[in-house]
């Protein structure tokens, strides 16, 4: 049986300050059951960037249509990028539970921020 893959195709993305950054992530299967979340950084100090069900993330929107059935594209777009947004972003699949359990992370995409052209 094939194992679930979490695919972040770009190792790095460079964006000018003020622009939007698209961070791509797809999964190979709809199972195991459980949510996808995005984080910046790894380990216990990582920062939650996007979780559909909890929190308020005004600068982050999912790329795919939120009413799309059987979606396996969990890419996000972050608007109005600033230098403070630089870092490595991870797309993480969780297995549903109480609480949800981290199952697999993508390889990460490093976001670098260029100075806004004058």
């Amino acid at each position: 049986e094939e194992e679930l893959q979490v695919i972040q195709p770009e190792k790095s993305v460079s964006v000018a300050a003020g622009d939007s950054a698209t961070l791509n992530c797809t999964v190979s299967s709809l199972i195991p059951v459980g949510p996808i979340q995005w984080f910046r950084g790894a380990g216990p100090g990582r920062e939650l960037i996007y979780n559909l069900k909890e929190g308020h993330f005004p600068r982050v929107t999912p790329v795919s249509d939120p009413t799309k059935r059987n979606n396996m594209d969990f890419s996000i777009r972050i608007s109005n990028i600033t230098p403070a947004d630089a870092g490595t972003y991870y797309c993480v699949k969780f297995r549903k539970g109480s609480p949800d359990v981290e199952l697999k992370s993508g390889a990460g995409t490093e976001l670098s921020v260029r100075a806004k052209p004058s």
Epitope: S29, L30, I31, P32, V33, P66, R69, N71, R95
Partner: antibody, heavy 120, light 108 residues
Amino acid sequence: EVQLVESGGGVVQPGGSLRLSCAASGFSFSIYAVSWVRQAPGKGLEWVSTIGADDTYYADSVKGRFTISRDNSKNTLYLQMNSLRAEDTAVYYCAKDSTVGWSGDFFDYWGQGTLVTVSS
Amino acid sequence: EIVLTQSPATLSVSPGERVTLSCRASQNVRSDIAWYQQKPGQAPRLLIYAASSRDTGIPARFSGSGSGTDFTLTISSLQSEDFGVYYCQQYYDWPPFTFGGGTKVEIK
């Protein structure tokens, strides 16, 4: 065309066992969660169990008595029902789960159901 | 466990009339509601998901609305083939998935 065909229902005495099967076709069975939902005679719908990959979920009313499993090589879903009670009498439907956006699951295709009667 | 309460329990309607069915959740379920139609002796059929998205092949006379705790299924002009029982289901917080008790739509 998606098809779900249940089998294995019948009459069983209280305390007995039964194994239901659901043969699936018309979709990539191995990448979807699948579920059992039941309906007691003249009553509403009650979710019973869901299986993802090796992750399984049960209603409290059947936990410890029922076991859901799947065989992706045969495109088949199973429900092993032990220690059956009169209140388990119902039509048991196999249902394909569907997700929307980044959200939870609902049921977009259903089989026609198989009747399980628990009676002495 | 999230409890879904459907009202009315039974509705007698003449063909051509507008029908409004209600589903109320005991807590916020965002838009994670599906609606099903079940005719006697048949399996349920998905009508609406994500509170307002029609499933493939479902006639435009069926529409869903609402978010949070209050949801509505509307049949704009009831056809004779629309009789049956209608169930809402929440999938915001599970297990367990929960269904409403159903609304029976009878043809007057």
